[in-house]
């Protein structure tokens, strides 16, 4: 067992004339995904076959939007690698498909839009254990670059994860017959895997995967006893030395194969013929289509409609994920303006706009002062979302219509008293003040601290505030 | 290799409930779907409920509000609470189990459900 890794370094145009166009736009931002479909050996397959070492697809990358006039860079790339777990031997020869989707981001109906950008293919020698591949593929305009390698899991070893290692049990060396497993010189390699379901009392094996019987005993898989009485129609001649076999289970008998898979009995063991979407030892493993139900929260599946093609979810607003299993938090981007109030009603987002606001987003200004007067010659000033009145002297109140008290805030310092007056206020101010607002004191001799006062006014008189 | 265990199929009268469960065991990548589909004698197989290891959940038109899917994670399984069972319902339902990362996915041998009076 292992996994099959791919970095993808970078999807843009290739090299020479006719550079691509950005498969983005201001009014359609998108984003990349990737899917890789992995098939043993190097036959020429159609793209539609079975992916069966395995497939995979990417996150989605980051949103892009075209700059106009730019031309189309290398685009931004989703995260991570793309695994493709495989559970049995890697097979060193192999067959790769590497697909570029667009999923666009527009405010179209059903979600977003799908689309295949590019699809590149390739048939490549590779060992288990090795250094990172790098490849460079074209498709049209297209350039993708990438690497790869497969690496075994633990305990498995070699070039194609078949060999085991185990840590070693004694400090000094490995148990009788087991070598120290390169490269990992402090772990041993394990006795052979033999068969699955070989039995452990019966059974042996010198190659991986085979099941060799002792003496009594038969069947591929070591579980029956070959019988000592005399016997009509055996199945082949006995080991034991008097009698035959039973006619007991062949390969084939009880049908070991899975969803409507033929057995037929090989030399060895037996072989199953699966029906289309089906593959695997047994049949057991089958591709995902839209026939699964992948696609959650009303996400509408396309493609997959038959066994050995991929499927894709469209999401409907407010959910995403390869198969629209997540929430968006729609309000998190605050798309509401001007402090407006964001609410995600499930099917819509809606926005409460502040007083003076309006538009879906809350992006229109109002005109406050259209259609407002203030009175008594007020000035009407825009602002926040709410007109506001500007008063002349004398007048105040929303719209200038109250008479102003301009004593009111007692504007007159140090004890000084004040008078309403038809041009304003007249600070009458207390002994040793002056000014219009009796902010100044009178030193004792006479003078008066900054400003002097004006010609014919004697300190103490009142002070008319212009 | 992911291997699937059924079990709870029986007969039941009209009415009556049901519930299936499903226990997943070998490689059960984290991010994966499992659910129930089943078929009925002559007929394809369809899905009946499936549930996404993240809780998101999708159920056949036909059996809302009379079924009910639900898994625990950290035992790999699925459960199917079946009520108000109708004749209709008699199929083999069978236990499905497949991986996101990989679009791979495997089906368990099957338990026969027989709605009867």
């Known amino acids: 067992a292992g996994v099959f890794e791919l970095q993808i370094h970078s999807f843009g145009p290739g090299p020479g004339p006719g550079a691509p166009r950005s498969p983005c736009s201001a009014r359609l931002p998108c984003r990349l995904f990737f899917r890789v479909c992995l098939k043993p050996g190097l036959s020429e397959e159609a793209a539609e076959s079975p992916c069966a070492l395995g497939a995979a697809l990417s996150a989605r990358g980051p949103v892009y939007t075209e700059q106009p006039g730019a031309p189309a860079p290398d685009l931004p790339l989703p995260d991570g690698l793309l695994q493709v777990p495989f559970r049995d031997a890697w097979p060193g020869t192999f067959s790769f498909i590497i697909e570029t989707w667009r999923e666009e981001l527009g405010d179209q109906i059903g979600g977003p839009a799908w689309s295949l950008l590019a699809r590149v293919a390739g048939r490549r020698r590779l060992a288990a254990g090795g250094p990172w591949a790098r490849d460079i593929q074209r498709a049209g305009a297209w350039e993708l670059r990438f690497s790869y390698r497969a690496r075994c899991e633990p305990p498995a070893v070699g070039t194609a994860c078949t060999r085991l290692c185990r840590p070693r049990s004694a400090p000094s060396r490995c148990g009788p017959g087991l070598r120290p497993c390169a490269p990992l010189e402090d772990e041993c390699e394990a006795p052979l895997v033999c068969r699955a379901g070989c039995s452990p009392e019966h059974g042996f094996c010198e190659q991986p995967g085979e099941c060799r019987c002792l003496e009594g005993w038969t069947g591929p898989l070591c579980t029956v006893p070959v019988s000592t009485s005399s016997c009509l129609s055996p199945r082949g001649p006995s080991s034991a030395t008097t009698g035959c076999l039973v006619p007991g289970p062949g390969p084939c008998d009880g049908n070991p194969c899975a969803n409507g898979g033929s057995c037929s009995e090989t030399p060895r063991s037996f072989e199953c013929t699966c029906p289309r979407g089906f593959y695997g030892l047994r049949c057991e493993v089958s591709g995902v289509t839209c026939a699964d139900g992948p696609c959650f929260n009303g996400g509408l599946c396309v493609g997959g409609a038959d066994p050995d093609s991929a499927y894709i979810c469209h999401c409907p607003p407010g959910f995403q994920g390869s198969n629209c299993e997540k929430r968006v938090d729609r309000c998190s981007l605050q798309p509401c303006r001007n402090g407006g109030l964001c609410l995600d009603l499930g099917h819509a987002l809606r926005c409460r706009c502040r007083a003076g606001f309006a538009g879906p987003r809350c992006e229109h200004d109002l005109d406050d002062c259209a259609g407002r007067a203030c009175a008594n010659g007020g000035t009407c000033v825009e602002g926040g979302g709410a007109h506001r009145c500007s008063c002349a002297l004398g007048f105040g109140g929303r719209d200038c219509r109250e008479r102003a008290d301009p004593c009111a805030a007692r504007p007159c310092a140090h004890g000084g008293r004040c008078y309403a007056h038809f041009s304003g206020l007249v600070c009458a101010c207390a002994p040793g003040y002056m000014g219009a607002r009796c902010e100044f004191p009178v030193h004792p001799d006479g003078a008066s601290a900054l400003p002097a006062a004006p010609p014919g006014l004697r300190p103490g008189d009142p002070q008319r505030y212009l | 290799e992911v291997q699937l265990v059924e079990s709870g199929g029986g007969l039941v009268q009209p009415g009556g409930s049901l519930t299936l469960s499903c226990a997943a065991s070998?490689?059960?990548?984290?991010?994966?779907?499992m659910g129930w589909h089943r078929q009925a004698p002559g007929k394809q197989r369809e899905l009946v409920a499936n549930?996404?290891?993240?809780?998101?959940?999708n159920y056949a038109d036909s059996v809302k509000g009379r079924f009910t899917i639900s898994r625990d994670n950290a035992k790999n399984s699925v459960y199917l609470q079946m009520n108000s069972l109708r004749a209709e319902d008699t199929a083999v339902y069978y236990c499905?189990?497949?991986?996101?990362?990989?679009?791979?996915?495997?089906w368990g041998q099957g338990t026969l459900v027989t709605v009867s009076s």
């Open positions: 499905r189990w497949y991986g996101i990362q990989r679009a791979e996915g495997y």
């Open positions: 549930m996404h290891s993240g809780g998101s959940t």
């Open positions: 070998g490689s059960t990548f984290t991010s994966n779907v």
